[in-house]
Structures are given as structure tokens and as C-alpha cells.
Interface confidence: low
């Protein structure tokens, strides 16, 4: 993950990243919107791999928990919002079918704006 | 991917998302910074799965290619920047070893700020 602070930059929204195991995650939402169970281990040729994910979300403790940094507040309301992406994971659906499905995981914290209509 | 526009919101940075196959990707950077080859297919219990990834990056054609939307320009310079995250992929390293490694993929477009020191 590139670190803007190293270049003397600030993010409009502060985020935190962490490795999340399937054991911590337990369930996820797949592309069809259904809830699936995320399996803890994935069989590979040389045994089993622990299934885990690199997740990034908005920092609930940070400066930007109330709104985005650097916004022109005269014209905009702002909010930092965690966005999601899809990654493939070994899962089990409600019918106990095990398979590789794309699930949604938190991957970023972005700023969304709503325009101030009048003063 | 949640769509702010549906809620009457705008993103500070415009992004585009697409599914990218391993064939299109060919290589990637792993967590140690080494270049690895991304294999086109993954063996699973019932045959093979095409390996592909959901990628999001800054829209080079969008309004925000020059800077972020909604920023207080009196105090800040801004730039939309593609950020990366890690996903597990079946890869081959320079030593011809095939294995599951975390590789970097584009997952978001965020706004970075630098403060304007003088007027």
C-alpha cells in the first residue's frame, strides 16, 4: 500500500489496513448478494493454506471520521466511506456447496460529496 | 462496488473498474517487490478456474484527472491517485516455483493533498 505521508502528502480520508483471517471474517457477501461462509483453509498441492485477506477501511478514530480533509465546506458536505471490491475466496453457500466465489471485502476509504444546494 | 451517485453523491475522485484476466495481466509485483508471472488458470477439484481480478483505478479521462473534486483550492493542492491492495494469486516466481502469493492490484482511486505554503 503506497503511503502518501512519506511524500509529505495527506489523504483526504484516513484509513487503516489489516490482515483478516477467514476465522475472524466467518461470513461474507458474494456477487449475487447472498451470504456465504468463508472457509478457514484452502487445499493446495502441498497441504493447506490459511485463507486471509488484506482489508482497508476508514479509520473510525481518525481526524476524518466527521468528514473529509481539505474539502471546500462552503459548497460541499463530505463523508469518508469504506468501499469494497471483489476477491476470490473458497466459500460454502447456504446449501452447503463449497466453491470458489467472488466475495466483497473492504479495500479503500474514499471521500464522497453532496453539493450544498443553498445557503 | 458501492455507487455513491445512486445516493445523489459524487466521488472526490472518479474511478473505473474492470475485470482483468491473468492473460491480460501477465505479471504482477508480489509483497517482497519481486515480479512474478500470474498463471492463467488455477487447478480446482473439478478442473480449472480462469484466474481474474476486479481492479479499480483512477479514470484518466474523467473530470478529476487534473485534481480532486470539491477541494478547498485556496489551501490545498490535490491529486487523484490509484492505490493498491494485496490479493492472493497463483503465480510463478523467477525461480520457476509455482505457489500462492499475495500480489498487488489496483483497488481504488483516492485523493491526496499537499498544503499550499504561501499565497
Amino acid at each position: 500500500h503506497s503511503d502518501p505521508a512519506r511524500r509529505g502528502e495527506l489523504s483526504v480520508c484516513d484509513s487503516i489496513s489489516e490482515w483478516v483471517t477467514a476465522a475472524d471474517k466467518k461470513t461474507a457477501v458474494d456477487m449475487s448478494g447472498g451470504t456465504v461462509t468463508v472457509l478457514e483453509k484452502v487445499p493446495v498441492s502441498k497441504g493447506q493454506l490459511k485463507q486471509y485477506f488484506y482489508e482497508t477501511k476508514c479509520n473510525p478514530m481518525g481526524y476524518t471520521k466527521e468528514g473529509c480533509r481539505g474539502i471546500d465546506k462552503r459548497h460541499w458536505n463530505s463523508q469518508c466511506r469504506t468501499t469494497q471490491s471483489y476477491v476470490r475466496a473458497l466459500t460454502m453457500d447456504s446449501k452447503k456447496r463449497i466453491g470458489w466465489r467472488f466475495i466483497r471485502i473492504d479495500t479503500s476509504c474514499v471521500c464522497t460529496l453532496t453539493i450544498k444546494r443553498g445557503r | 462496488h458501492s455507487d455513491p451517485a445512486r445516493r445523489g453523491e459524487l466521488s472526490v475522485c472518479d474511478s473505473i473498474s474492470e475485470w482483468v484476466t491473468a492473460a491480460d495481466k501477465k505479471t504482477a509485483v508480489d509483497m517482497s517487490g519481486g515480479t512474478v508471472t500470474v498463471l492463467e488458470k488455477v487447478p480446482v477439484s473439478k478442473g480449472q478456474l480462469k484466474q481474474y481480478f476486479y481492479e479499480t483505478k483512477c479514470n484518466p479521462m474523467g473530470y478529476t484527472k487534473e485534481g480532486c473534486r470539491g477541494i478547498d483550492k485556496r489551501h490545498w493542492n490535490s491529486q487523484c491517485r490509484t492505490t493498491q491492495s494485496y490479493v492472493r494469486a497463483l503465480t510463478m516466481d523467477s525461480k520457476k516455483r509455482i505457489g500462492w502469493r499475495f500480489i498487488r492490484i489496483d483497488t481504488s482511486c483516492v485523493c491526496t493533498l499537499t498544503i499550499k505554503r504561501g499565497r
Epitope: - | 517482497s32 516466481d93 525461480k95 520457476k96
Partner: antibody, heavy 121, light 107 residues
Framework: DVQLVESGGGVVRPGESLRLSCAAS????????MSWVRQAPGEGLEWVSG??????????YYADSVKDRFTVSRDNSKNTLYLQMNSLRAEDTAVYYC????????????WGLGTLVTVSS | EIVLTQSPGTLSLSPGERATLSCRAS???????LAWYQQRPGQAPRLLIY???TRATGIPARFSGSGSGTEFTLTISSLQSEDFAVYYC????????FGGGTKVEIK
């Protein structure tokens, strides 16, 4: 000068366990991939196991003949490579060499003198 | 798995003579991913050649490697007393495997 010194060999009965160590010096141990290679008495060389350096999350690799019985690990703070050998068999009798993998691929540019493991009832 | 077959098993030569050792692979080895090692009695193996023909650091010019595909050769142009040893080839196009070795002995 690069030095690799193996220890921990000895005589054990079939089914028993043994842990080999390899103390490394003369190079930045943590960043290099390392391997164990063995040589049965009067026989040729056989690659046993390898482990990636710090850039590769210390991922282990094994030959089919030892998979599920041997475990390779490393302690970068101690500049030491380990090989935990469980469920030993007579055919595991060999001199076990610790070897530093070359950066460009899995061949071995430095070797230790080896430690002898004898599995016999 | 790539199987490497070395020949001859034993080579009896006199000092000063030329030694030619062969290593044949069960399938083609990409980009000459082959190494040669020397092992003297009671010593650890020593890397001589990698990538088929590149001499390792400190290896004398009398040692040379050649070949591609499935046929590889190690040549010692003029045998010195310290060269009498066992020589192994090793491929790294796949998981590492070694040949059975060629013993070069004094005639």
C-alpha cells in the same frame, strides 16, 4: 567469508524425530532463500527442502519424499536454519547439508560440511 | 520430475588429460537451467558452473560447461591433482534434481 555449520545429527530409531540446525555467518542470512540437501551413504545428492527469505514470507517447499514428515523453518534473528524431521525412516539415513540458494534460481552457491543422520533399529 | 543421467559412472584419467563429463535430461531444460558441482572426498559440494556455461566465482578457467536442451557437458581441459573428485549436475528448471554423479579418478 560465508560459513554454514550444521548440527543436530545422530542415531535414531525408525519413527523417531530429530531437529537439525544450520548456523549461518558471513552474509545477510535473512534475505536469502536456503535449502537442505541430503546424501545417502555412497549415493548422490537429493534436494530435501527449501525456505524463502524475508522477501518471500519464509514460504517452505518440500520434496515429495519428505512432505508431511519434515518441516523447514528459520530464525533470522539467530541466523539459523532448521529442519524438523519426524517419523524418520531407514531411507532418511544420510548426510544433511545446509545450502545457500543463489539469488537467481534454486542452485546452491555455498554449502555446509553436513551432519550425519542415521536411522536404524 | 526431470531425471538427470550422468555418464560415464567413472572416468579414469591421468593428470594433464582432458575430461569430458556428460549429463542427459529426461526432458528439455529451458534456458540451460543447469549447474555443475564438484565434491571431493569428505567435503561439501562446490558450485562450478551455473546456467549451463557460466563459471561460478573463483572457479579456474580449465572448467567449462556447454550444451542445451537435454544434453550438457562439463569439460576439464587439463586435469590437476585437486580435480580428482565426484561431479554432479543439477537442473533448476523444475524442482531441483541431481544426476547420479561421475567419479573422476587417477588412472
Amino acid at each position: 567469508d560465508v560459513q554454514l555449520v550444521e548440527s543436530g545429527g545422530g542415531v535414531v530409531r525408525p519413527g523417531e524425530s530429530l531437529r537439525l540446525s544450520c548456523a549461518a555467518s558471513g552474509f545477510t542470512f535473512s534475505i536469502y532463500d536456503m535449502s537442505w540437501v541430503r546424501q545417502a551413504p555412497g549415493e548422490g545428492l537429493e534436494w530435501v527442502s527449501g525456505i524463502r527469505g524475508s522477501g518471500g514470507d519464509a514460504v517452505p517447499y518440500y520434496a515429495d519424499s519428505v512432505k508431511d514428515r519434515f518441516t523447514v523453518s528459520r530464525d533470522n534473528s539467530k541466523n539459523t536454519l532448521y529442519l524438523q524431521m519426524n517419523s524418520l525412516r531407514a531411507e532418511d539415513t544420510a548426510v544433511y547439508y545446509c545450502a545457500k540458494e543463489n539469488n537467481r534460481s534454486i542452485f546452491f552457491d555455498y554449502w555446509g560440511l553436513g551432519t550425519l543422520v542415521t536411522v536404524s533399529s | 520430475e526431470i531425471v538427470l543421467t550422468q555418464s560415464p559412472g567413472t572416468l579414469s584419467l591421468s593428470p594433464g588429460e582432458r575430461a569430458t563429463l556428460s549429463c542427459r535430461a529426461s526432458r528439455s531444460i529451458g534456458r540451460s537451467f543447469l549447474a555443475w558441482y564438484q565434491q571431493r572426498p569428505g567435503q561439501a559440494p562446490r558450485l562450478l558452473i551455473y546456467d549451463g556455461s557460466t563459471r561460478a566465482t573463483g572457479i579456474p578457467a580449465r572448467f567449462s560447461g556447454s550444451g542445451s536442451g537435454t544434453e550438457f557437458t562439463l569439460t576439464i581441459s587439463s586435469l590437476q591433482s585437486e580435480d580428482f573428485a565426484v561431479y554432479y549436475c543439477q537442473q533448476y528448471d523444475d524442482w531441483p534434481s541431481f544426476g547420479g554423479g561421475t567419479k573422476v579418478e587417477i588412472k
